[in-house]
């Protein structure tokens, strides 16, 4: 058993049929010594008496808010949550496996630049009685500070018969050095509580591996005289790290016909312009990637040829 926060405790249980559970000692936070009784949740049924109470916790019916009383007055509370371990593996019932980039991916994180700011998100089908708490650090043995905000519901989607809820959180490394080579990974830890069930999820990454630039901005077409060719130009996204001479991007320019089946013409360039043939009803799209490190491509920025 360990304390999650004041008056909230997590009991770690091996979860199998007829498991003996854990014996937990509860102590009433009071100077009183006599006449103390204990109840669980809203029940008026008395569980026991005394300043300390030893209880057996083996199922969710044993979790909940234990309250000590004296003469009808509430003295203190202890909320017990359960963390299930089945066949040596902690439960992952609350969050959905996103299966990207690999199985058992519950947290996904992205950074728009090297400033030390990043966003993580996760999915669940649970809509109520759900709380999240996020902590992060650079390294784990001698952790350096990363400050995370509160997790917020960022999207709701309908997937077949189910509703899916996306939560996200923004974090910022306290003393980020954008140009430095990373040697210790960022660690992100999410505590998830659904009713009386506790779970924790972790992710470990280097900022360089989660970089995904915003799409190029100000995408423009300039027709070339007496030609079907056009000059496409764009700019670095505002959110990308500066100076651009050091934090350089490479770009992919694509000409796509109206039909998905039509052949795509693609040009790769380190410049912020390119000359392409603009077919009727086609569109031109440009995306960006870190020039020196193969992290994710940005989403496409697009304009119609006409």
């Amino acid at each position: 058993i360990w304390e999650l926060k004041k008056d909230v405790y997590v009991v770690e249980l091996d979860w199998y049929p007829d498991a003996p559970g854990e014996m937990v000692v509860l102590t009433c936070d009071t100077p009183e010594e006599d006449g103390i009784t204990w109840t669980l949740d809203q029940s008026s049924e008395v569980l026991g008496s005394g300043k300390t109470l030893t209880i057996q916790v083996k199922e969710f019916g044993d979790a909940g808010q234990y309250t000590c009383h004296k003469g009808g007055e509430v003295l203190s509370h202890s909320l017990l949550l359960l963390h299930k371990k089945e066949d040596g593996i902690w439960s992952t019932d609350i969050l959905k496996d996103q299966k990207e980039p690999k199985n058992k991916t519950f947290l996904r994180c992205e950074a728009k630049n090297y400033s030390g700011r990043f966003t993580c998100w996760w999915l669940t089908t649970i809509s109520t009685d759900l709380t999240f708490s996020v902590k992060s650090s650079r390294g784990s043995s001698d952790p350096q500070g990363v400050t995370c905000g509160a997790a917020t519901l960022s999207a709701e989607r309908v997937r077949g018969d189910n509703k899916e809820y996306e939560y996200s959180v923004e974090c910022q490394e306290d003393s980020a050095c954008p140009a430095a080579e990373e040697s210790l990974p960022i660690e992100v830890m999410v505590d998830a509580v659904h009713k009386l069930k506790y779970e924790n999820y972790t992710s470990s990454f280097f900022i360089r591996d989660i970089i995904k630039p915003d799409p190029p901005k100000n995408l423009q077409l300039k027709p070339l005289k007496n030609s079907r060719q056009v000059e496409v130009s764009w700019e670095y996204p505002d959110t990308w790290s500066t100076p651009h001479s050091y934090f350089s991007l490479t770009f992919c320019v694509q000409v796509q016909g109206k039909s998905k089946r039509e052949k795509k013409d693609r040009v790769f360039t380190d410049k912020t312009s390119a000359t392409v043939i603009c077919r009727k009803n086609a569109s031109i799209s440009v995306r960006a990637q870190d020039r020196y490190y193969s992290s994710s491509w940005s989403e496409w920025a697009s304009v119609p040829c006409s």
Epitope: E45, I55, K58, E59
Partner: nanobody, 115 residues
Framework: EVQLVESGGGLVQPGGSLRLSCAAS????????MYWFRQAPGKGHEWVST????????AYADSVKGRFTISRDNAKNTLYLQMNSLKPEDTALYYC????????RGQGTQVTVSS
């Protein structure tokens, strides 16, 4: 008629063991929280242990934790209290109850721990 009858008490040396039984009739112990209490000579009654409905999770007073074990046999409709490493201060009249306030309780069985 709702009834509880305890048995298994006796005289035992310090460090010894006893197993108390509480046979219930007129109701099912598996549907109720069940309690063991004790009353030492010249003292008030003291809660010892509780067993809950469902999976039968248990609770113990500080004075007996790690030494006493409460259990039940639903088929026999009987409650038990296994008492190990007995001490002279465990000497008391032990009784089982269906309610915290002792509305439904047995007459008790005497346990004496003495050398």
């Amino acid at each position: 008629e709702v009834q509880l009858v305890e048995s298994g008490g006796g005289l035992v040396q310090p460090g010894g063991s006893l197993r108390l039984s509480c046979a219930a009739s007129g109701f099912s112990i598996s549907d109720n929280w069940m309690y063991w209490f004790r009353q030492a000579p010249g003292k008030g009654h003291e809660w010892v242990s509780t067993i809950k409905t469902g999976t039968g999770s248990t609770a113990y007073a500080d004075s007996v934790k790690g030494r006493f074990t409460i259990s039940r046999d639903n088929a026999k409709n009987t409650l038990y209290l296994q008492m190990n490493s007995l001490k002279p201060e465990d000497t008391a009249l032990y009784y089982c109850a269906r309610d915290w306030d002792g509305t439904v309780r047995g007459q008790g069985t005497q346990v004496t721990v003495s050398s």
